[in-house]
């Protein structure tokens, strides 16, 4: 948690924030972890500390290593670690995985791509944006503040996007680039009449008296986020909460589990210490949404414990 990976390219600016955050009034000391040598705060140095920030202006491959920051309040000292790796510039266009920031997803309605780490830098608009190393041109692309907006997003817009900007420090300019992948997701959702995947209709579930038993009610309702969808259990047509048997409880399983893009819900019925009278009850798995309600009924039957001695008679 308090060790953070940071990376950059040689001859570009890199600014790293101490992963251990403190109040603005707290002092922060930076050290090279390997030597415990203090990092200077004087801005004339190529690598210097400035409060919560460690600045490489510009970075060199030899700067790679672990840096320690100690945040000091009047009564507490707390430590963080920045694991910095500086890479040589690639001669070809491909951006290797180790230089990529987190992937972002977009859709027709939301197609913002934020420039990673830009908030750490002193930069001025506009940002330059590239896709797969080609400068972006055309009215569909708009560089706005620290992000790129793509109008009328299509699946072909997926790819690696690089932002390039200039960091200014005391009148000197340093280049910074950052790349992240952009994926396009289809937001075409729909809603169906509920489909119960489990249990099967009129299923007989074998249980052992005195043991615990679980019944899972699982149903799918369509694709994408569902406005109204629920699964629940009933006992003899009565809600579990109203039935009044503390041994029998229901709890949500995986919520909105999008397997194959489908929006599904699970509800697990837990029966503790199964009793004879539980075999007489009717267990209904109910799935409902705006289209209507579907019910699958389960009954319990006694499972005779295997008499291991008799096997070898």
């Amino acid at each position: 948690k308090f060790s953070k990976q940071s990376w950059g390219l040689e001859n570009e600016a890199l600014i790293v924030r101490c992963p251990r955050q403190g109040k603005p009034s707290y002092t922060v000391d930076w050290y090279y972890s390997q030597t415990n040598k203090s990092i200077p705060t004087q801005e004339r140095n190529r690598v210097f500390a400035s409060g919560q920030l460690l600045k490489f202006l510009p970075a060199a491959v030899a700067d790679s290593g672990i840096y320690t920051c100690i945040v000091r309040s009047p009564t507490f000292n707390r430590t963080g670690y920045a694991n910095v790796t500086i890479y040589k510039k690639q001669s070809d266009c491909n951006v290797p995985d180790y230089l990529m920031y987190s992937t972002v997803s977009g859709s027709e309605k939301n197609s913002k791509i934020y420039c990673p780490t830009i908030d750490l830098y002193n930069w001025t608009a506009p940002l330059e944006w590239f896709k797969n190393c080609q400068a972006l041109q055309g009215s569909r692309y708009r560089a706005h503040k620290s992000f790129l907006v793509i109008d009328n997003v299509m699946t072909e817009d997926a790819g690696d996007y690089t932002c390039k900007f200039i960091h200014n420090e005391n009148g000197a300019n340093y280049s910074v680039t950052a790349t992240r992948s952009f994926t396009v997701k289809d937001e075409q959702g729909f809603s169906l009449f509920p489909v119960i995947g489990a249990p099967a209709q009129n299923e007989i579930k074998e249980v052992e008296i005195g043991k615990n038993a679980n019944l899972t009610c699982s149903a799918c309702f369509g694709k994408g986020t569902q406005f109204l969808a629920a699964v629940l259990w009933q006992l003899n047509g009565t809600k579990i909460t109203d039935f009044g048997e503390p041994r029998i409880q229901q709890e949500e399983g995986q919520n909105q589990s999008f397997s194959n893009g489908l929006a599904c819900l699970d509800m697990v019925l837990r029966i503790a210490d199964v009793k004879e009278e539980d075999l007489l009850l009717q267990y209904d798995c109910l799935a409902l949404n705006l289209h209507g309600l579907r019910r699958h009924t389960v009954r319990l039957s006694r499972k005779n414990p295997i008499d291991h001695h008799s096997i070898y008679c």
């Epitope: 948690k1 308090f2 955050q21 403190g22 109040k23 309040s73 009564t75 507490f76 707390r78 430590t79």
Partner: antibody
Framework: EVQLLESGGGLVQPGGSLRLSCAAS????????MIWVRQAPGKGLEWVST????????YYADSVKGRFTISRDNSKNTLYLQMNSLRAEDTAVYYC????????????????WGQGTLVTVSS | EIVLTQSPATLSLSPGERATLSCRAS??????LAWYQQKPGQAPRLLIY???NRATGIPARFSGSGSGTDFTLTISSLEPEDFAVYYC?????????FGQGTKVEIK
């Protein structure tokens, strides 16, 4: 010297209400996160609620959510806990405490505690 | 919610002996763990923060260690004033939670 002084405890019937206060002194109250922690007789410590510093965001334990409200008056250096719909299981010594570090969305230790005020919920 | 389990529930030792208290978390809390001491009729007192750092004014005989899910508070040589209840607390996220406590009593 940092000091926290709770008041407002007492005997209350189930379903009743009580308002606890915690007067703070010796530090810049407004910038610190403040916390209520309770301890039932003979039992361990249970976090009740946190209110962040200037931002004022609030957090509650599930056991008190919807019934208790934490608030602060930075001009009076005072922390409050409004307790409604009290239950027997709310009987405890209530401590107010200071989180000396927290930044937005994070939590830390409690470095100063009050002496506590006893709340008894009984008919 | 992260559950902290302290062991043993009670530790019976003599002054001068070494006390080793354990705190286990139900999931990783990194080093976001503190130890407190509480004496009867008093509020808890912070001993250790960030798993291993002693709070201001805490004697060097108290030390903390561990990371992730397993943590230890060690009192190298018990003084008469150290007999009390000790609690661990995690603060990696809300809700912050405490262990149920370990009582260190005089044998």
């Amino acid at each position: 010297e940092v000091q926290l002084l709770e008041s407002g405890g007492g005997l209350v019937q189930p379903g009743g209400s009580l308002r606890l206060s915690c007067a703070a002194s010796g530090f810049t109250f407004s910038i610190y996160d403040m916390i209520w922690v309770r301890q039932a007789p003979g039992k361990g410590l249970e976090w009740v609620s946190t209110i962040k510093g200037e931002g004022g965001g609030t957090y509650y334990a599930d056991s008190v959510k919807g019934r208790f409200t934490i608030s602060r008056d930075n001009s009076k250096n005072t922390l409050y806990l409004q307790m409604n719909s009290l239950r027997a299981e709310d009987t405890a010594v209530y401590y107010c405490a200071r989180d000396p570090w927290s930044t937005e969305g994070s939590f830390f230790v409690l470095d100063y505690w009050g002496q506590g005020t006893l709340v008894t919920v009984s008919s | 919610e992260i559950v902290l389990t302290q062991s043993p529930a009670t530790l019976s030792l003599s002054p001068g002996e070494r006390a080793t208290l354990s705190c286990r978390a139900s999931q990783s809390v990194d080093d976001d763990l503190a130890w407190y001491q509480q004496k009867p009729g008093q509020a808890p007192r912070l001993l250790i923060y960030d798993a291993s750092n002693r709070a201001t004014g805490i004697p060097a005989r108290f030390s903390g260690s561990g990371s992730g899910t397993d943590f230890t508070l060690t009192i190298s040589s018990l003084e008469p004033e150290d007999f009390a209840v000790y609690y661990c607390q995690q603060y990696i996220g809300a809700p912050i939670t405490f262990g149920q406590g370990t009582k260190v009593e005089i044998k």
